[in-house]
Interface confidence: medium
């Protein structure tokens, strides 16, 4: 089954997820993997290089690249498809003669797959197709895995330990190198010294960009730094055993002097810049519930204080094939009810020291619009509406009907597809709106479908406030007020005048205002006034009145 694309180019968690780092998790470590092997420039190494005057240049590999692309995502940003790098473009390692910096603020060096890797190679040989962040084969961002000169082998199994890798490139390249893969799949260089090998490098050269893995012990809250070298090096003051420096406190610098019989003085002075403890960071879901159906917000929170410089901490996220380097990300225009996997990692001085993954299911979305089949009135006081339900999940319907300015709403069971409206007012236009809703993290209403009908006519109500007054001996003036409910299309007032059982007058006016003349004197009359709406007559209002004797 193919993954479901969202409007942002994310894919749902049904597809294989793309880890941030290329190496597998070491056995029995708790949650965090070593960072993938990146070729790095000297300025990104875990080192401060101190060189003697005789060592002022660095042999570099001459096959240069001049291709690069930079990601640009700043702030808490919405998803954009990033420009993908074709090659990592790290610069030549320097043994100290030249200085490398980034211009501008940290934000200008965004989302380099590894620090320095978006700097176009400007020296021969640094065609570093290093593992761009990430290198899982399913990722669209995958670049060819290079057998880097300094790839980290898988770390030994450690219970309750976290592996953190600080990778930089090996400054010194021997004349003859054999590249092999270690059991972990990482590249390892074994060097074979042959007649053409140059004279021994200084240890400062040889280990100029030694890579360091930091192992965090959650119980002791101390780090161990593992020096990624192929030979068992010696450390000044015996500070390391088996290429490991133990009991390092978070956020403290430690200086280690490294030497080996394969290299000459000066020794390599390695400054270990120890990261903060991993448990001081927590990945928090900051999604607003109102928007949880189409957005995801993730934010790293510092839940404890530490003394490391926070400016040296950078954050990376990968959700699907989208990559960001913000502390907080907001993904928008997602599909409701879909799972999205986001991997994140935190780097200290551009070296990963912790990561986390979250699978977030977006909330139920607003239901779709119901499809009204018909709505009509077949009687004066009744109406009917039938519909097809929307496709998406919902809990119930709300049916509202509006006459003039009055509005009534009903909650209807989700299984209903028809509703009979009762006690409607005759000959009245009703506007109906029907929407489905779902109660998720918040109630979400679907779009309303609208229809209208006019109820059938019915007899109007009685006229009221009828008066009969004598205007002369034989003339009467009959007036009344309109009915409260006309209940039909037309307006006509009727007056019937009876004497005994005989209809003596039958008049019809637009207004209820009748002047009845030439009546018999001294006679009892019955006056019946009623309203006719074009379809039905109303109940008559009846008054009795007598003419008087003629005054003459």
């Amino acid at each position: 089954q193919s993954p479901t694309p969202s409007p942002t180019g994310l894919t749902t968690a049904k597809m294989p997820s793309v880890p941030l780092s290329s190496d597998p998790l070491p056995t029995h470590t708790t949650a965090f993997s070593p960072a993938s092997t990146f070729e790095r420039e000297n300025d990104f190494s875990e080192t401060t290089t101190s060189l003697s005057p005789d060592n002022t240049s660095t042999q570099v590999s001459p096959d240069s690249l001049d291709n690069a692309s930079a990601f640009n995502t700043t702030g808490v940003s919405s998803v954009q498809t990033p420009h993908l790098p074709t090659h990592a473009d790290s610069q030549t390692p320097s043994a100290g003669t030249d200085t490398q910096t980034f211009s501008g603020s940290a934000a200008n060096a965004k989302l380099n797959p590894t620090p320095g890797s978006n700097a176009i190679s400007d020296v021969p040989g640094e065609r570093s197709t290093a593992s761009t962040f990430p290198t899982d084969p399913v990722s669209p961002l995958t670049t060819t895995l290079s057998l880097a000169h300094h790839s980290s082998a898988a770390l030994p199994a450690r219970t309750s330990n976290t592996t953190i890798t600080a990778n930089t490139s090996d400054a010194y390249l021997n004349a003859s190198e054999t590249t092999t893969l270690s059991p972990s799949g990482s590249a390892v260089i074994s060097t074979t010294t042959i007649a053409t090998t140059p004279s021994k490098p200084t240890c400062d050269e040889k280990y100029a960009n030694i890579t360091v893995d930091y192992l965090y012990n959650k119980e002791t809250k101390l780090f161990t730094a593992k020096l990624n070298v192929n030979e068992n090096v010696e450390c000044g003051n015996n500070t390391c055993t088996n290429n490991e420096v133990h009991n390092l406190t978070e956020c403290k610098n430690a200086s280690v002097s490294i030497s080996h019989n394969s290299c000459t003085a000066p020794d390599k002075t390695l400054i270990l810049d120890v990261p903060p403890g991993v448990e001081k960071f927590q990945l928090h879901d900051c999604t607003q519930v109102e928007k949880a159906d189409t957005t995801i917000c993730l934010k790293w929170k510092n839940i404890e204080t530490f003394t490391c410089d926070t400016q040296n901490i950078t954050y990376r996220f990968q959700c699907g094939n989208m990559i960001f380097d913000n502390k907080e990300i907001k993904l928008e225009n997602l599909e409701p009810e879909h799972e999205y996997k986001c991997d994140s990692e935190i780097l200290y001085n551009n070296h990963k020291f912790t990561n986390a993954s979250k699978i977030i299911k977006t909330d139920f979305g607003s239901p779709g619009e119901p499809q009204i089949i018909f709505c009509r009135s077949e009687a004066a006081h009744q109406g009917v509406i039938t519909w097809n339900p929307p496709q998406r999940s919902f809990h119930n319907f709300t049916l509202c009907y509006i006459k003039e300015t009055e509005k009534d709403c009903l909650n209807l069971d989700k299984n209903l597809i028809k509703y009979d409206l009762q006690n409607l007012k005759p000959y009245t236009k009703y506007v109906l709106s029907l929407h489905a809703y779902i109660i998720a993290k918040v109630q979400r209403n679907g779009s309303a479908a609208m229809c209208h009908f006019t109820t059938k006519s019915a007899p109007p109500s009685q006229v009221w406030n009828m008066t009969v007054s004598m205007t002369s001996d034989n003339s009467m003036h009959v007036k009344c007020r309109p009915p409260r409910d006309r209940n039909g299309p037309h307006e006509r007032y009727h007056l019937e005048v009876e004497a005994g059982n005989t209809l003596v007058r039958n008049e019809s006016h637009k207004n209820c205002d009748f002047r009845v003349k030439d009546l018999q004197y001294s006679t009892d009359y019955t006056f019946k006034a009623y309203f006719h709406n074009g379809d039905y007559p109303g109940e008559p209002f009846i008054l009795h009145h007598s003419t008087s004797y003629n005054s003459k």
């Epitope: 420039e41 570099v60 240069s64 690249l65 001049d66 610069q91 211009s103 380099n112």
Partner: antibody
Framework: QVQLQQSGAELARPGASVKMSCKAS????????MQWVKQRPGQGLEWIGY????????KYNQKFKDKVTLTADKSSTTAYMQLSRLTSEDSAVYYC??????????WGQGTSVTVSS | DIVITQDELSNPVTSGESVSISCRSS???????????LNWFLQRPGQSPQLLIY???TRASGVSDRFSGSGSGTDFTLEISRVKAEDVGVYYC?????????FGGGTKLEVK
């Protein structure tokens, strides 16, 4: 066609700073590094350093690292070099040059800087 | 730093003759990929440098076949056959194998 257009000549006093520009056109600015080279009157060429406009990554010749600041503006496809604390030693023509795979293939016309009190 | 040395030409060259310009590196510019990272430039009077030869012997686009480069890891020669008046200027060699990149001091060619 590829062109590198450098800003005009500068006359500055000792101790001052100057900032020159190199406007690139005719190619994708972010796909090549921009190199800077110094040539003192009647003398040879000296490599100052370069900037990768794509990432902002800079590498300096150690000799110039306290003298020069390189920047680039992707939106205007322009690279800049600022010289600070000028002395008479800084009087020279400064070239920007695009770096191809194995060579500096296109050069600007040069910006002349004269430091004089 | 790698030091690049260029010799001066003692006399102006007659138009139509051939001339060799030498360049020596303090360190081999042959890298393990088999390429030699030595480039030649010509800077005509009042102009910017122009690339002639790269990787020791490959002519740059648009450069006359009268120009050819050769050499070993440390000793290099730029050969100009049938010299023309337009060939006057200063010829520089440059190494790109190691930072900082360095140029030779230049060889001035005069044509009579």
């Amino acid at each position: 066609q590829v062109q590198l257009q450098q800003s005009g000549a500068e006359l500055a006093r000792p101790g001052a700073s100057v900032k020159m520009s190199c406007k690139a056109s005719g190619y994708t600015f972010t796909s090549y590094t921009m190199q800077w080279v110094k040539q003192r009157p009647g003398q040879g060429l000296e490599w100052i350093g370069y900037i990768n406009p794509s990432s902002g990554y800079i590498k300096y010749n150690q000799k110039f690292k306290d003298k020069v600041t390189l920047t680039a503006d992707k939106s205007s496809t322009t690279a800049y070099m600022q010289l600070s604390r000028l002395t008479s030693e800084d009087s020279a023509v400064y070239y920007c040059a695009r770096r191809g795979s194995y060579f500096f293939d296109f050069w600007g016309q040069g910006t002349s800087v004269t430091v004089s009190s | 730093d790698i030091v690049i040395t260029q010799d001066e030409l003692s006399n102006p060259v007659t138009s139509g003759e051939s001339v060799s310009i030498s360049c020596r590196s303090s360190k081999s510019l042959l890298y393990k990929d088999g390429k030699t990272y030595l480039n030649w430039f010509l800077q005509r009077p009042g102009q910017s440098p122009q690339l002639l030869i790269y990787l020791m012997s490959t002519r740059a686009s648009g450069v006359s076949d009268r120009f050819s480069g050769s050499g070993s890891g440390t000793d290099f020669t730029l050969e100009i056959s049938r010299v023309k008046a337009e060939d006057v200027g200063v010829y520089y060699c440059q190494q790109l194998v190691e930072y900082p990149f360095t140029f030779g001091g230049g060889t001035k060619l005069e044509v009579k």
